[in-house]
């Protein structure tokens, strides 16, 4: 669809008549002086001469004169008002690329190197300095110490889970992260001792210290990563560290 | 966050003990447990027992046999009963909200169990 | 259970002084302490949590330390409105328990 749709333009011809004025002249007419005789009158004679030319007549009315040629087109007219729009036409080929602002292609593309360098440096950072990476999981921690409940808000505030390690080399990136003991995404609360993790789906490693998990109290529904990198069953009420894993 | 116990001052040997723990300013159920704590004359605190956000309990096992900790939501309210009292269960009563420590308590109740 | 013993029982300074309050858990917590203070009449506060951590609003004159079974609530040049009574908390192992107190008093 065109963005300014054209607008019909009405042009009127304006044929200006033209006319010829034709003037017809009529004969003066003649005058005879009367003639006295004494004499029985004879018969006439015969026609005198002609007299001399009469006074000119008045103006005779305009004759009926030939119509003359067409003239020349009148000027041109003012614009009459829009027609209605006209149904939509067929759809246009495909244009042609556009240019860049500056004429540059390439200017987006090395700009957009340039971010996506300056982004892997930042990850770089970030795992020297506060998480740890194995695989396509990054480990973060803020160092604050919370309950589960906050943990979770706080992980899917940032569009991440509660870190939960899948495998030894998992377990180990969390524990070598973490000074003191750190929460699991892992809890039992919906079926008593069947740990699952926040997704529903039930574990495939697991790493338990020696007689856990023990429901002690019998609210020990969450589980701990304890500094030695072993698990331990407490309940989600307490304040532990909040680890974070984040998906790359 | 505050909490506030109400209850009887005085409880006859052998009776329940019933307690109420009125929370204002959070909902009992968004998060942390909820629980009782009293302080006998000797100033010695006792940790008694929780409900937690999600409505689980947990009490301690010297007092597992006749104590019992439940909670109205409706009301923000949760409540302690203490049954078969003796004259040694005479105390300051507390409740408080707890994450690992005890970070909001009431005012406390003096509760006196005397013939 | 987790016994949790505070030394001295009662403890008599002078406004000014630097003091260090004990607590000794029966068996290793790990760093799972917390520390209250409760004058005459008033419920007990949270002055410390897991052993050093620093509780928003609690002057920085109290610090805590230690880790295992060992933990020291120090309070550097006491102030009159610190008397009153400490206790020490442990979170490690179910059922909750504190200790026994210490009584800090004037001189």
């Known amino acids: 669809m065109s963005l300014f749709p054209s607008l019909p333009l009405l042009l009127l011809s304006m044929v200006a008549a033209s006319y010829s004025e034709t003037v017809t002249c009529e004969d003066a007419q003649k005058t005879c002086p009367a003639v006295i005789a004494c004499s029985s009158p004879g018969i006439n004679g015969f026609p005198g001469k002609d007299g001399r030319d009469g006074t000119k007549g008045e103006k005779g009315e305009p004759g009926q004169g030939l119509r003359g040629l067409q003239g020349p087109p009148g000027k041109l007219g003012p614009p009459g008002n829009p027609g209605p729009s006209g149904s939509p036409g067929p759809k246009g080929q495909k244009g042609d690329p556009g240019k860049s602002p500056d004429g540059d292609s390439s200017l987006a593309a090395s700009e957009r190197k340039a971010l996506q360098t300056e982004m892997a440096r930042i990850k770089k950072w970030l795992t020297f300095s506060l998480g740890k990476q194995v695989g396509n999981k990054f480990f973060l921690t803020n160092g604050e110490i919370m309950t589960f409940e906050k943990v979770k808000a706080l992980c899917v505030k940032f569009q991440a889970s509660v870190a939960t390690p899948r495998n030894a080399a998992e377990n180990g990136a969390i524990q070598n992260l973490i000074k003191e003991e750190a929460f699991l995404g892992i809890t039992d609360e919906k079926t008593e001792g069947q740990f699952v993790d926040l997704t529903g789906n039930r574990l495939t490693y697991t790493n338990w210290n020696e007689g856990e998990p023990n429901n002690a109290g019998s609210d020990e529904d969450c589980v701990l990563l304890l500094k030695n990198g072993q698990w331990n069953d407490v309940p989600c009420s307490t304040s532990h560290l909040a680890v974070c894993e984040f998906p790359i | 966050v505050q909490l506030q116990e109400s209850g009887p001052g005085l409880v006859k040997p052998s009776q329940s003990l019933s307690l109420t723990c009125t929370v204002t300013g959070y909902s009992i159920t968004s998060d942390y447990a909820w629980n009782w704590i009293r302080q006998f004359p000797g100033n010695k605190l006792e940790w008694m027992g929780y409900?937690?956000?999600?409505?689980?309990?947990s009490y301690n096992p010297s007092l597992k046999s006749r104590v019992s900790i439940t909670r109205d939501t409706s009301k923000n309210q949760f409540f302690l009963q203490l049954n078969s009292v003796t004259t040694e269960d005479t105390a300051t009563y507390y409740c408080a909200r707890w994450e690992s420590w005890f970070a909001y308590w009431g005012q406390g109740t003096l509760v006196t169990v005397s013939a | 259970d987790i016994v949790l013993t505070q030394s001295p029982a009662t403890l008599s300074v002078t406004p000014g002084d630097s003091v260090s309050l004990s607590c000794r858990a029966s068996?290793?917590?790990?760093?799972?302490l917390h520390w209250y203070q409760q004058k005459s009449h008033e419920s007990p506060r949270l002055l410390i949590k897991y052993a050093s951590q620093s509780i928003s609003g609690i002057p920085s004159r109290f610090s805590g330390s230690g880790s295992g079974t060992d933990f020291t609530l120090s309070i550097n040049s006491v102030e009159t409105e610190d008397f009153g009574m400490y206790f020490c908390?442990?979170?490690?192992?179910?059922?909750?328990?504190f200790g026994g107190g210490t009584k800090l008093e004037i001189k």
């Open positions: 409900i937690s956000y999600s409505g689980s309990t």
């Open positions: 908390q442990q979170s490690n192992s179910w059922p909750y328990t």
């Open positions: 068996q290793s917590i790990s760093n799972d």
